[in-house]
């Protein structure tokens, strides 16, 4: 696993990554505990302390050494070297920068053989980002009169992100105001504790339901909208059903 | 490297208006919102407003709403900040800030008859 | 709006000293941003979304919290750290500031 705290943090899990030495019980290098090595990309804002860790077994026990892009990595490789734990298996990078960006890979290796696993790391200069909206969301969607319909929008956001959901509409007959602005109108917005902005649910639509809806997100960063359509049908004419998008409505921090 | 460069100092009587620029540089302007904060004379900070370069939009805090006018030339990459019936506890320090992390310079105000 | 208390609103240390400020917002928050500002001179980030250090800032300094309740730690002051501390909530407009935490040599 890999930390991106200000600190640098003690292993204090209890799982057992340093296996004691049996020479009946002789084998080559293996990994004993995956689970803290699935995440192979790693996106730590710059100045942050980053840890990778490869816990293993083996006997006699193994070695450990440290790849960087595929070369042996030195301490004077960068800026206030690093630091090997070996009895945790793992690589500590303080104060990170851009220039620790690349590919690091753990060779863990005995005389009965050599197992490796390479970790990603992006340094980013500045995490908070612009709201992310997944692609194909919210959906085209259509139904019949009397129907009902729900548009979802998923949104990606490392700051709190205030959620709109948007409609296009005519006064007087026009779409567009003096300013040539379009006339717009907020069916659904979050509050700060507010739940399912994510969601749009029109209940009993009539042919006046029909058109763009657009999901604006901002935070204090930025901005990120996508809109999708909604097409009603005349009641004897059944829908088109499109292909069902089941994604979890809430957005993910 | 990113710049946020403000107009100068200005001194105005009660009453009269002030328009302060905010000429961005160094990233894309219409991507982030440029926020307002201005800080009185041995003051802590105050938020009043923001605008989204790309379509216009703002977020005013309402204390100031209908004496803060937030404004933006894209062309120029600049964002500008109109207060106007000026008061003198309106003497501050006005700052222009994108992403939190990018700041103007600061322009001081100074509102005395 | 979410009103922030900052505490305490001075502070007298020495370099090499363990400092914490501490946050109370008037209702719960995703996240906090803490500034540290000179006389004279813009604010500049600290900490953003609670406990990320914004680039460049020495790793000295740390942020946590959750909820209504956000503290800044400075591990061990050094002298370029006398300054006034802010907190900042992004997340509900109107987005607002603490009154700020003066830290003075002792």
């Known amino acids: 696993d890999a930390i991106s705290s200000g600190d640098d943090e003690d292993d204090t899990d209890s799982s057992e990554d340093f296996v004691s030495e049996n020479r009946s019980n002789q084998r080559a290098p293996y990994w004993t505990n995956t689970e803290k090595m699935e995440k192979r990309l790693h996106a730590v804002p710059a100045a942050n302390t980053v840890k990778f860790r490869c816990p293993a077994g083996g006997n006699p026990t193994p070695t450990m050494r440290w790849l960087k892009n595929g070369k042996e990595f030195k301490q004077e490789h960068r800026i206030g070297g690093y630091k090997v734990r070996n009895q945790h298996w793992s690589l500590i990078m303080e104060s990170v920068v851009p220039s620790d960006k690349g590919n690091y890979t753990c060779l863990v290796e005995n005389e009965y053989g050599s197992i490796n696993h390479t970790y990603h790391l992006d340094v980013v200069e500045r995490s908070p980002h612009r709201p992310i909206l997944q692609a194909g969301l919210p959906a085209n969607a259509s139904t019949v009169v009397g129907g009902d319909v729900e548009f979802v929008c998923k949104v990606y956001s490392d700051a709190q992100p205030h959620i709109q959901w948007i409609k296009h509409v005519e006064k007087n007959g026009s779409k567009y105001g003096p300013d040539g602005l379009p006339y717009l109108k907020v069916l659904k917005h979050s509050g700060i504790n507010s739940s399912n902005a994510e969601v749009l649910a029109l209940f009993n639509v009539t042919e006046m339901d029909a058109g763009e809806y657009i999901c604006k997100v901002s935070n204090y960063i930025g901005q990120a909208n996508q809109s999708a359509w909604l097409t009603v049908l005349p009641k004897q004419q059944a829908p088109v059903r499109e292909k069902e998008i089941t994604a979890s409505p809430d957005y993910l921090e | 490297e990113v710049q946020l460069v403000q107009s100068g100092a200005e001194v105005k009587k009660p009453g009269a208006s002030v328009k302060v620029s905010c000429k961005a540089s160094g990233y894309t302007f219409t991507n982030y919102w440029m926020h307002w904060v201005r800080q009185a004379p041995g003051q802590g900070l105050e938020w009043m407003g923001a605008?989204?370069?790309?379509?216009?939009?703002?977020n005013y805090n309402q204390k100031f709403k209908g004496r803060v006018t937030l404004t933006r030339d894209t062309s120029i990459s600049t964002a500008y900040m109109e207060l106007s019936r000026l008061r003198s506890d309106d003497t501050a320090v006005y700052y222009c800030t994108s992403r939190g992390d990018y700041w103007g310079q600061g322009t001081t105000v100074t509102v005395s008859s | 709006a979410i009103q922030l208390t900052q505490s305490p609103s001075s502070l007298s240390a020495s370099v090499g000293d363990r400092v914490t400020i501490t946050c109370s917002a008037s209702?719960?928050?995703?996240?906090m941003s803490w500034y540290q500002q000179k006389p004279g001179k813009a604010p500049k980030l600290l900490i953003y979304d609670t406990s990320n250090l914004a680039s460049g800032v020495p790793s000295r300094f740390s942020g946590s919290g959750s909820g209504t309740d956000f503290t800044l730690t400075i591990s061990s002051l050094q002298p370029e750290d006398f300054a006034t501390y802010y907190c900042?909530?992004?997340?509900?407009?109107?987005?607002?500031f603490g009154q700020g935490t003066k830290l003075e040599i002792k």
């Open positions: 900042q909530q992004w997340s509900s407009y109107p987005y607002t």
């Open positions: 209702s719960g928050l995703s996240y």
């Open positions: 605008i989204y370069p790309e379509n216009g939009d703002i």
